[in-house]
């Protein structure tokens, strides 16, 4: 069995998680892609997905999550803006390919969000570098209801710093002006 590896990101409240999921260009360019959260012992839950077929570099926004699929580069960009402590958890990118099971893109993301120190540079959104306007043309796509049972056969060990995201927290509020402090990124 494939070992499910994780990459860990430690960010402060108000910052932005900015990750890129690589995929095989020829195989998956126009396939619908999704961002999921995985809770221990549960099926992965889809939080946002691209349109079907996926449109090139067309931002899709669901609450505080923005997906951009760059077909020409085999790259799905995922941003979670204005992070909250409750966003901590384990995430993954997947490619929907009905009728087959979703294809998981490695690695999984272990996100740990901690409280910022008010007024301290670097700890909150006021210390960031770039103000981004989410284009008004962003779309909310409908995501398939099914998820792959294969991806939950063995949940990875939970990080001690992990805080599970309650279901109620998935109803993310819309953001029109965001300030980005990516992990890069």
């Amino acid at each position: 069995a494939t070992k499910l590896t994780e990459e860990k990101y430690e960010l402060k409240e108000g910052q932005t998680l900015d990750v890129k999921c690589d995929y095989t260009l020829e195989k998956f360019a126009s396939s619908q892609k999704a961002w999921q959260i995985i809770r221990d012992g549960e099926m992965p839950k889809t939080l946002a997905c691209t349109e079907r077929p996926s449109k090139n570099s067309h931002p899709v926004q669901v609450g505080r999550i923005i997906l951009e699929d760059y077909h020409d580069h085999g790259l799905l960009r995922v941003r979670m803006v204005n992070l909250q402590v409750e966003d901590s958890g384990l995430y993954q990118c997947v490619i929907y390919q009905p009728p087959k099971e979703p294809h998981m893109l490695f690695d999984r993301i272990r996100l740990v969000v901690t409280k910022g120190f008010s007024g301290t540079p670097g700890s909150n959104e006021n210390s960031t570098q770039n103000v981004y306007k989410i284009p008004p043309t962003t779309t909310k796509a409908l995501c398939p209801l099914y998820t792959s049972p294969r991806t939950v056969t063995q949940a990875p060990p939970k990080s001690t710093a992990d805080v599970s995201t309650p279901d109620s927290e998935i109803n993310l509020t819309n953001v029109t002006d965001i300030i980005r402090v990516p992990v890069f990124n």
Partner: antibody, heavy 126, light 107 residues
Framework: QVQLVQSGAEVKKPGSSVKVSCKTS????????VSWVRQAPGQGLEWMGG????????DYAQKFQGRVTITADASTSTGYMELSSLRSEDTAVYYC???????????????????WGQGTTVTVSS | DIQMTQSPTSLSASVGDRVTITCRAS??????LAWYQQKPEKAPKSLIY???SLQSGVPSRFSGSGSGTDFTLTISSLQPEDFATYYC?????????FGQGTKLEIK
């Protein structure tokens, strides 16, 4: 093998602007990252900002916000860093650094600054 | 901003010695740490990324370890060409920040 070639040394007056270029070859420019780092005489390294051409927008260190503009021209695989309102403290060697896109196992995009240009000396003096 | 503190600031050693340089982050940065080597009048050179991964072409005598807030760069057996200044850098979150540098000199 990725190579970076920066533009030549510049001498500028206080209050003016300087634009340094960084031409890359041998890498996937559009989906890689170009960062700019400076080093004042006898001092350490200071990250100024970076850009991933396909995303279009750059990110800057707060210290330089409003004075620095980082751009990229994918057609020529060239990155640019323009610093305005120059003062004597801006006298430094300016480096571009290229982060080739690593496909596959890792999400983290702005990896370590893998390949560096030779540096461009900018002297600000009246 | 995340502060990166290197120690020692300077270090004298001999060829063949084993040398360790440490870098501490003011907050957790997972494994998003890089090490660079810089010689006088030259551009920095990348040695290690992701705390412990060796950049292509870098000799295996260089190694990195650590995660969270504490990291080390080890040179197992110093060679004459290793005398230089070494910098650590975090890239967990913007703005990326460097340590102040460790100057490695010949004893």
């Amino acid at each position: 093998q990725v190579q970076l070639v920066q533009s030549g040394a510049e001498v500028k007056k206080p209050g003016s602007s300087v634009k340094v270029s960084c031409k890359t070859s041998g890498g996937t420019f559009s989906s890689s990252a170009v960062s700019w780092v400076r080093q004042a005489p006898g001092q350490g390294l200071e990250w100024m900002g970076g850009i991933t051409p396909i995303f279009g927008t750059a990110d800057y260190a707060q210290k330089f916000q409003g004075r620095v503009t980082i751009t990229a021209d994918a057609s020529t695989s060239t990155g640019y860093m323009e610093l305005s309102s120059l003062r004597s403290e801006d006298t430094a060697v300016y480096y571009c650094a290229f982060t080739p896109r690593y496909r596959g196992s890792s999400h983290h995009y702005y990896y370590a600054l893998g390949v560096w240009g030779q540096g461009t000396t900018v002297t600000v003096s009246s | 901003d995340i502060q990166m503190t290197q120690s020692p600031t300077s270090l004298s050693a001999s060829v063949g010695d084993r040398v360790t340089i440490t870098c501490r982050a003011s907050q957790g940065i997972s494994s998003w740490l890089a090490w660079y080597q810089q010689k006088p009048e030259k551009a920095p050179k990348s040695l290690i990324y992701a705390a412990s991964s060796l950049q292509s072409g870098v000799p295996s005598r260089f190694s990195g370890s650590g995660s969270g807030t504490d990291f080390t760069l080890t040179i197992s057996s110093l060679q004459p060409e290793d005398f230089a200044t070494y910098y650590c850098q975090q890239y967990n979150s913007y703005p990326y920040t460097f340590g102040q540098g460790t100057k490695l000199e010949i004893k």
